[in-house]
Amino acid sequence: AITEAREEAKPYPLFPGPLPGSLQTDHTSLLSLPHTSGYQPALMFSPTQPGRPYTGNVAIPRVTSAGSKLLPPLAFKHTVGHIILSEHKDVKFNCSISVPNIYQDTTISWWKDGKELLGAHHAITQFYPDDEVTAIIASFSITSVQRSDNGSYICKMKINNEEIVSDPIYIEVQGLPHFTKQPESMNVTRNTAFNLTCQAVGPPEPVNIFWVQNSSRVNEQPEKSPSVLTVPGLTEMAVFSCEAHNDKGLTVSKGVQINIKAIPSPPTEVSIHNSTAHSILISWVPGFDGYSPFRNCSVQVKEVDPLSNGSVMIFNTSASPHMYQIKQLQALANYSIGVSCMNEIGWSAVSPWILASTTEGAPSVAPLNVTVFLNESRDNVDIRWMKPLTKRQAGELVGYRISHVWQSAGISKELLEEVGQNNSRAQISVQVHNATCTVRIAAVTKGGVGPFSDPVKIFIPAHGWVDHAPSSTPAPGNADPVLII
């Protein structure tokens, strides 16, 4: 489409025919009026005129005459100063200059807002030589103008190292309002004021703003752009947009959702990843965050064994990663586990509770009343003990581990023996004579080895020495008994 243009500055008439601002359709007027310059409707002529190939910036032949000694200063002819058109129209404008033939090597370039236009733009320069002067018309055309084409265009001519600059041609592309700032989605606290901003520009100006909340206008009277809407507070989610109006019509911004911050939804899918005797590794899937970032989470652990206290342990942890290792648990116990997370508004409800169990643990107490003595043959050390008072939580007793350390001058060696759970006595061979044997015993379950009993020492004499006196675990308070023979 060929655009209409309005002349804002009123230059001299360019053509004897139609008035400026109307569509120019006389294709031959350019040939008959070589000195013409100014706005031309788009797509008026082909790049080259018949009979005159396009030569671009050519060297103009020197022509001397008596009248050329006092040449007037070179200047571009006055042209249309301001072109107003709608977006997506085509436009063409030009500047013209008559150059005496004595000048050579002329070039014309187009500039927009101080920057030279190079490359892809559609610029054509045509030459119309006469006896003494050559009329040069430089045309610039834009197809489907956009707002980015707005600006001040000038022609520049370099001639004999001098620069001649045309008057500016202002291109004003008008259209519907264009948003430079639209309202943004927000998450807000219930009943708390907040602001939304909307800014739109023309041309044409002015641009007026109406605010819309949930499809209903908020302000009866428009506000000039930019506009800030102060919302005193919301109790439920709302969608806001703004309408920008100018002489060309109306543009509506994107609709933005204003969410009300709430407590999060409870976490889901609490899962057990690993259980040990005293710890459980869990993970969970966070619930909806309530439009406010999670701050932290709370793992709640409740004893559920039939006669347990039911004590509730609460472990606070960061919101991510969504995993936590619960520690300090009893062995072989059942627990109910739930997770709750919080944001700035508050705590979520607790996730669905899941049941988890710890595994068997090592015994927590050592065997009691450990007694050690030499038998008559002196080849064996006889060890006796009492079964520890273990809670079943420690796991099923599978046996005992006996440590016996033999020490004499320059020798120290430790040996370990394993015996079954039904035993409460064991015999070990004498390893070294004239030495001290130190015995400790630990209970063993599938969960591991428990603590060793206090050491009991017995002296093993050289051959030929017999003594039946036992050595035993001391009464509480005696840390390191030694049987002296």
Partner: antibody, heavy 117, light 107 residues
Framework: QVQLQQPGAELVKPGASVKVSCKAS????????MHWVKQRPGQGLEWIGR????????NDNQKFKGKATLTVDKSSSTAYMQLSSLTSEDSAVYYC??????????WGQGTLVTVSA | ETTVTQSPASLSVATGEKVTIRCITS??????MNWYQQKPGEPPKVLIS???SLRPGVPSRFSSSGYGTDFVFTIENTLSEDVADYFC?????????FGSGTKLEIK
């Protein structure tokens, strides 16, 4: 120190309901199971059920399903047991109990519920 | 449900004698057996809890043994103040179940 306060006695008519209370003090109410136990005169003990005030989880003895309903009021640290459709078989002493360290360590003094026309 | 069978229902001993009460359970309960004493007009009092653990403050003349299904409660050197009803309670599984009780008298 831990205390569980129960009313001494309740007299109710057959077919009616009664709500026995147990006010806890001296410990964190929401941290421990609360059990209820029935003892008929001159007879043994029967476990009715338990409730956890933290999240009101309950475990009931099937024998008392429909008969006993356990609730709590966290704000007053009080546990309740409602007995419905009462008959002479429900005449008994009802104890609230909390376990500690693997045993029923703390008992209320018991509420004697008498069902009589 | 684990049933608990307690015997005897009653017994009478002279002071200084040994008392033995037995509870047998219908399922293996490990060592989750508890023993209670109840005097007239009072709530029961725990003497021994799970794992044959004597409760703090309970005289050492009270003891228990057993694991699995067979449990024994013993009072050595019975005193007149031991006159009471004695109950066992299994705490391995829900519902918790009590023995029927043993009434102890002094001759």
């Amino acid at each position: 120190q831990v205390q569980l306060q129960q009313p001494g006695a309740e007299l109710v008519k057959p077919g009616a309901s009664v709500k026995v209370s147990c006010k806890a003090s001296g410990y964190t109410f929401t941290n421990y199971w609360m059990h209820w136990v029935k003892q008929r005169p001159g007879q043994g003990l029967e476990w009715i059920g338990r409730i956890h005030p933290f999240d009101t989880e309950t475990n009931d003895n099937q024998k008392f399903k429909g008969k006993a309903t356990l609730t709590v009021d966290k704000s007053s640290s009080t546990a309740y047991m409602q007995l419905s459709s009462l008959t002479s078989e429900d005449s008994a002493v009802y104890y609230c109990v909390i376990p500690a360290n693997g045993g029923f360590a703390y008992w209320g003094q018991g509420t004697l519920v008498t069902v009589s026309a | 449900e684990t049933t608990v069978t307690q015997s005897p229902a009653s017994l009478s001993v002279a002071t200084g004698e040994k008392v033995t009460i037995r509870c047998i359970t219908s399922t293996d309960i490990g060592d989750d057996m508890n023993w209670y004493q109840q005097k007239p007009g009072e709530p029961p009092k725990v003497l021994i809890s799970e794992g044959n653990s004597l409760r703090p403050g309970v005289p050492s003349r009270f003891s228990s043994s057993g694991y699995g299904t067979d449990f024994v409660f013993t009072i050595e050197n019975t005193l007149s103040e031991d006159v009471a009803d004695y109950f066992c309670l299994q705490s391995d599984n829900l519902p918790l179940t009590f023995g029927s009780g043993t009434k102890l008298e002094i001759k």
